[in-house]
């Protein structure tokens, strides 16, 4: 059970693995479902800038390089904790909230909606 | 800037849009790269459950259904934060804590370092 | 912390079998890939084979397909290397890793390798 407030201490750990945790990031280039990064930044929010995933195409790249329609590029979301001041410019006192961001693309075989 | 130690209220807000968060839950068994989902828990931590997407195969599935080794699955992953207990049990005092979880998977084209 | 416990070398004959055995603990939880790698005298680390720990996929290097079979335990949290039909040119020690990124894992990431076991294949 967790109390409804509580201290924190924002000197952040870092829970590293046995390799490199940048490894990720060019994937993004590599992937038949290619994303790119927007910024979203909000000097209210801890942290202040998260990076948002927008799938390139709407068809997966095939092996010719080429964007399949008969394939979808979706986005992988994950909802994920950040601390929202609060009040409004609050120092020391936050809120903990909840969003909902896409960390990048899968590519996956269309659902097929059938029109009568 | 941010000081040392805050308050939290964890009373949650939830910021997500009207579109259904669990939308992509159906995306780990239909991508090229396919995952499972593997629960995390750990009283120690807030949040307490955290779902880690493990790929299913070394390569990705091709029009076939087979696995196509020429392709690559691999984890798309996101460094989030969350609430370590500090010290252990602590009921209200917490650390912010940076881990790294595997989100999903997605098919990339290999870079061939040691796979001939 | 990975923790990563290799036996089953030895001193064998050419054309001799060994079976290699792999202990692995401290894995994070996105762990789907387990991989055999081997570094003989003189030369760098190089890539053996790969399993998934969810499908039982392999993958193998060039040199070793047909001869060599990996196979896992997930209940242990073990992976073994069957080698068959070896040659002095299979001859050094082998380490076995988690491998994170799956084929895409690059030798020069890993932070913790073990020990490793001596494979020495005489003619």
């Known amino acids: 059970n967790f109390p409804r407030t509580v201290m924190v201490n924002l000197n952040i750990h870092n829970r590293n693995t046995n390799t490199n945790p940048k490894r990720s990031s060019d994937y993004y280039d590599r992937s038949t479902s290619p994303w790119n990064l927007h910024r979203n930044e909000d000097p209210e929010r801890y942290p202040s800038v998260i990076w948002e995933a927008k799938c390139r195409h709407l068809g997966c790249i095939n092996a010719d390089g080429n964007v399949d329609y008969h394939m979808n590029s979706v986005p992988i979301q994950q909802e994920i904790l950040v601390l929202r001041r609060e009040p409004p410019h609050s120092p020391n006192s936050f809120r903990l909230e909840k969003i909902l961001v896409s960390v990048g693309c899968t590519c996956v075989t269309p659902i097929v909606h059938h029109v009568a | 800037n941010f000081p040392r130690t805050v308050m939290v209220n964890l009373n949650i807000h939830n910021r997500n849009t009207n579109t259904n968060p669990k939308r992509s839950s159906d995306y780990y068994d239909r991508s090229t790269s396919p995952w499972n989902l593997h629960r995390n828990e750990d009283p120690e931590r807030y949040p307490s459950v955290i779902w880690e997407a493990k790929c299913r195969h070394l390569g990705c599935i091709n029009a076939d259904g087979n696995v196509d080794y020429h392709m690559n699955s691999v984890p798309i992953q996101q460094e989030i934060l969350v609430l370590r207990r500090e010290p252990p049990h602590s009921p209200n005092s917490f650390r912010l804590e940076k881990i790294l979880v595997s989100v999903g998977c997605t098919c990339v084209t290999p870079i061939v370092h040691h796979v001939a | 912390q990975v923790q990563l416990v290799e036996s089953g070398g030895d001193l064998v004959q050419a054309g001799g079998s060994l079976r290699l055995s792999c202990a692995a603990s401290g894995l994070t939880g996105s762990s789907y890939a387990m991989g055999w790698f081997r570094q003989a005298p003189g030369k760098e680390r190089e890539f053996v084979a790969a399993i998934s720990w969810i499908s039982g996929d392999t993958k193998y290097t060039d040199s070793v397909k047909g001869r060599f079979t990996m196979s896992r335990d997930n209940a242990k949290k073990q992976v073994y290397l069957e080698m068959n039909s070896l040659k002095p040119e299979d001859t050094a020690v082998y380490y076995c890793?988690?491998?994170?990124?799956?084929?895409?894992?690059?030798?020069?990431?890993?932070?913790?390798w073990g020990q490793g076991t001596q494979v020495t294949v005489s003619s």
């Open positions: 890793n988690d491998m994170p990124y799956g084929l895409d894992t690059r030798m020069d990431e890993y932070v913790y």
